[in-house]
């Protein structure tokens, strides 16, 4: 029978006797930076080439006994998870291994850097097809390791890394914290976060998604036909590296941004029990478990978007937080969130020729998050239209006035500390979907985009009585690009997108009272691209 | 011991070929920064990655490394260049005393310096 982990990542339509065709991932080369490996193990024989690269520190302790099978254990298992003939994800992928971890599973940042440089030089000397680099290791936050990962990613290499096994914020570790790297947390057969002794999988905004990482059957270095079960975020990352190899083999031209968006899009949503994570990390941690796409082609027509959270701004009066999209992505909307509710909104602004999302803390606030909605929108031309605070009681409004531009997101930002708590809510005049409306003391920012075949619509869900959370979702075939609250009153903690649902959070109802002030409306902007759909149909 | 002699020889050569003082002082207003692992047990003091500014060429990286060795030797410190980076990041890996960090941060082309640290199988 199929091991639980392979079944979990396999869409139902694939599930037959045989998990996958034997050549899945055959156009892709996966580099593994790990321990030494037993490359003649029957599970990986002929699939893994051991390079002559080795950069490891000496083992600790004078009494350490170097036993080959122990030295090879971690790397052999991971190579098997990626491409093993029986228990591998991408059975056709070829691999190259670099030894950067010693027999105790320990390496150095510098050794890893030299390994990444070796990969880049190999790529330049002999360009092959798509490359995936698996980094099943973690150390403390390292600026230089993150920078090297960024450079390699910008050279077209897909990097996949373990989130870390420290039951901690992945942003405190490298390469997990590098934005260009696909960072993977671990879940078990019950889709719960993996506990490892007193610790467990890392979590937080630096994790892109989770994947099976407990009781994973794979090649054992104890003998050439042995199998063993291992657990950890390394195993989870190996699954995603295998899935990435499968996807790149089917569509070799996929960019890193496209691959990441597809990984997120095809993941199982909302299956992880978030109670395992610390309360302050739940909203930041993606509730996604990786899976193979239901079919290798035909995803191109979709408008893909993902949510990117900033680091926390910190509590100072003028503190701000910035969320950025990847280079090939468009920022289609910007929202903000504060647990205390004390914030001064958010705005989209240009930084280095690219739009970023900046959130502003308020006096007495514990800090804010900026939340960017980052989308793949080819040939897009987006701009931000701003309306300063209006003096009229009707509130501030701004719309997309350029021909062919559609509204993809609304943001509001205010300088006053308290945004008119006692003023009645401002409601959007009906029949004006291309318009952002906000509080009269706030400046309003509309994200307006022109792209072939792009169409968007506004969807609202209002609740008259106070409620901690109001949601509105885009229907099938439409993608959530914008998420905001109407009105921008003080008891709203903020708004953010979770998959295709816009979530507006309010202060605890017990402290709000049930006046009209409690009314909250969640506003979603849902878009689709007819152009992408047509292009896809023509291909098929 | 052989290694150390080799290093010393290299240093003498570097001393002879290097002009005195800082020929290329760092650009005004840009200060290189020092980074180290926040998790103390994972730190590896004594080995440092010197990262140079983005457009630095390999020859400049080598020259900067040699300059560091020469200036360190003048102060009575032995250093060893373990690796010169190029292809991903310009810079070099150096084994040296932490006492030399202030000196190294003032070298031309230096963007930042990071103390080496451990990584672990997950």
């Amino acid at each position: 029978s199929i091991p639980w982990n392979l079944e979990r990542i396999t869409p139902p339509r694939y599930r037959a006797d045989e998990y996958q065709p034997p050549d899945g991932g055959s156009l892709v080369e996966v580099y593994l930076l790990d321990t030494s490996i037993q490359s003649d193990h029957r599970e990986i024989e002929g699939r893994v080439m051991v390079t002559d690269f080795e950069n490891v520190p000496e083992e600790d302790g004078t009494r350490f006994h170097r036993q080959a099978s122990k030295c090879d254990s971690h790397g052999t298992h991971l190579a098997g998870v990626v491409s093993g003939r029986d228990a591998g994800v991408a059975k056709g992928a070829s691999m190259r291994s670099l030894r950067v971890l010693n027999c105790q599973g320990k390496g150095t940042v510098s050794g890893t850097l030299i390994g990444l440089e070796f990969i880049r030089k190999s790529q330049l000397v002999q360009p092959v097809g798509p490359l995936v680099v698996l980094l099943p290791l973690a150390g403390g936050y390292s600026r230089v390791l993150n920078a090297a990962c960024q450079r390699l990613a910008r050279a077209g290499v897909v990097l996949v890394t373990a989130a870390g096994n420290f039951r901690d914020d992945a942003c405190l570790y490298s390469p997990a914290s590098a934005p260009e790297v696909i960072t993977v947390g671990a879940t078990n057969a019950q889709d719960q976060p993996v506990t490892l002794g007193t610790l467990g999988t890392n979590f937080g905004r630096c994790v892109d998604l989770f994947a099976p990482g407990e009781d994973i059957i794979g090649a054992s270095s104890d003998c050439s036909t042995c199998f063993v079960s291992q657990s950890g975020t390394s195993q989870a990352a190996a699954h995603v590296a295998g899935i990435a190899a499968m996807m790149l083999s089917a569509e070799p031209e996929l960019t890193l941004a496209e691959l990441r968006q597809r990984l997120i899009h095809f993941s199982a949503k909302d299956v992880i029990n978030e109670a395992w994570f610390p309360e302050d990390q739940r909203v930041l941690t993606p509730n996604l478990v990786a899976a193979l796409p239901p079919s290798t082609h035909g995803a191109g027509w979709q408008l893909f978007c993902r949510t990117v959270w900033s680091a926390h701004s910190g509590p100072t009066r003028m503190a701000t937080a910035v969320a950025r999209c990847a280079p090939d992505e468009e920022l289609l909307s910007c929202s903000s969130f504060s647990r205390s509710g004390k914030r001064r909104g958010e705005r989209m602004e240009a930084q280095g020729g690219k739009l970023v999302c900046r959130a502003h803390n308020a006096f007495g606030g514990e800090g804010v998050y900026a939340i960017a909605r980052c989308c793949l929108l080819p040939q897009a031309n987006c701009s931000v239209h701003t309306a300063p605070p209006a003096e009229a009681s009707m509130g501030t409004r701004v719309h997309c006035h350029q021909q062919g531009h559609v509204l993809t997101g609304c943001s509001s930002h205010w300088e006053v500390e308290d945004l008119g708590t006692h003023k009645p809510p401002v409601l959007r005049p009906r029949g004006q979907p291309n318009q952002c409306v906000g509080h009269r003391e706030a400046s309003i920012h509309a994200s307006c985009c022109h792209a072939p075949g792009l169409e968007c619509k506004v969807k609202e869900h209002g609740i008259p009585a106070p409620q901690e959370q109001v949601t509105v979702a885009c229907e099938e075939g439409w993608t959530l690009t914008g998420c905001s609250a109407l009105p921008g009153t003080s008891h709203v903690l903020g708004a953010y997108a979770v998959d295709n649902t816009c979530v507006v959070r309010s202060r605890d109802v017990s402290t709000t009272g049930s006046t009209s002030e409690g009314a909250v409306t969640a506003v979603a902007i849902c878009c689709r691209s007819r152009h992408l759909a047509q292009a896809s149909q023509e291909l098929q | 011991q052989e290694d150390e002699d080799g290093d010393y020889e290299e240093l003498v050569l570097a001393l002879r070929s290097e002009e005195d003082g800082l020929a290329e002082a760092p650009e005004h207003g840009t200060t290189a920064t020092f980074h180290r692992c926040a998790k103390d047990p994972w730190r590896l003091p004594g080995t440092y990655v010197v990262v140079l500014k983005e457009e630095t060429h390999l020859s400049q990286s080598e020259r900067t490394a040699r300059r560091l060795q020469a200036q360190a030797a003048r102060r009575g410190y032995l250093t060893k260049i373990l690796h010169v980076f190029h292809g991903l990041l310009p810079g070099f890996l150096v084994k040296m005393s932490g006492d030399l960090l202030e000196l190294a941060l003032k070298l031309p082309h230096v963007d930042y310096i990071e103390e080496d640290s451990s990584v672990f199988a997950q």
């Epitope: 037993q38 003998c223 036909t225 | -």
Partner: antibody
């Protein structure tokens, strides 16, 4: 190119031992072990076992346990198969092949056991 | 051990004929089946691995199919150099086991 070259034919008496060698070239030996397969005259193929260049690990067919020993010498890229206490039904052509996949074969070594 | 049964044990055919050889496993071997060609006095040569994959250098007239317990090797248009003995081999379990062979002779 990738090839396996075996030692020459052997004639042995019953009860004796034979050691057949197989020299690998043209590929990274550590990435594959060596399988040994034999074929008695006019018969089919029989897998005897596998040996690793990487760490010397072995995997023997049950029928061979105790009588056969497979070893490797990575320094010369050579694998060896020794068969002891030879019997007349050990008369066969002995082949080495690359790995469990057996995608490359040696030319074969004829071992004749006759009194 | 898994038993492999080939049929027919021999067949006569002419150049240009389409030839089919079947192989049955005593239990499911998924798609872990290889086919070898052996000419008199020569070592076997891998023709097909994993039921249907042709290694580079093997002519396209050779094809393999099947999964589970029943497998087929097809030579779409028999050539003079194809007269040989063909063996199937399961690669699912250790020890690997071979079929008894199918001899393809000139009619």
């Amino acid at each position: 190119q990738v090839q396996l070259v075996q030692s020459g034919a052997e004639v042995k008496k019953p009860g004796a031992s034979v050691k057949v060698s197989c020299k690998a070239s043209g590929y990274a030996i550590y990435n594959y072990g060596i399988s040994w397969v034999r074929q008695a005259p006019g018969q089919g193929l029989e897998w005897m076992g596998w040996v690793s260049f990487y760490n010397g690990n072995t995997n023997y067919a049950q029928k061979l346990q105790g009588r056969g020993t497979m070893t490797t010498d990575p320094s010369t890229s050579t694998a060896y198969m020794e068969l002891r206490s030879l019997r007349s039904d050990d008369t066969a052509v002995y082949y080495c092949a690359r790995g469990y996949v057996m995608d490359i074969w040696g030319q074969g070594t004829t071992v004749t056991v006759s009194s | 051990d898994i038993q492999m049964t080939q049929s027919p044990s021999s067949l006569s055919a002419s150049v240009g004929d389409r030839v089919t050889i079947t192989c049955r496993a005593s239990q499911s071997i998924n798609n872990w089946l290889d086919w070898y060609q052996q000419k008199p006095g020569k070592a076997p040569k891998l023709l097909i691995y994993a039921a249907s994959t042709r290694p580079s250098g093997v002519p396209s007239r050779f094809s393999g199919s099947g999964s589970g317990t029943d497998f087929t090797l097809t030579i779409s248009s028999l050539q003079p150099e194809d007269f040989a003995t063909y063996y199937c081999q399961q690669d699912q379990d250790i020890p690997p086991t071979f079929g008894q062979g199918t001899k393809v002779e000139i009619k």
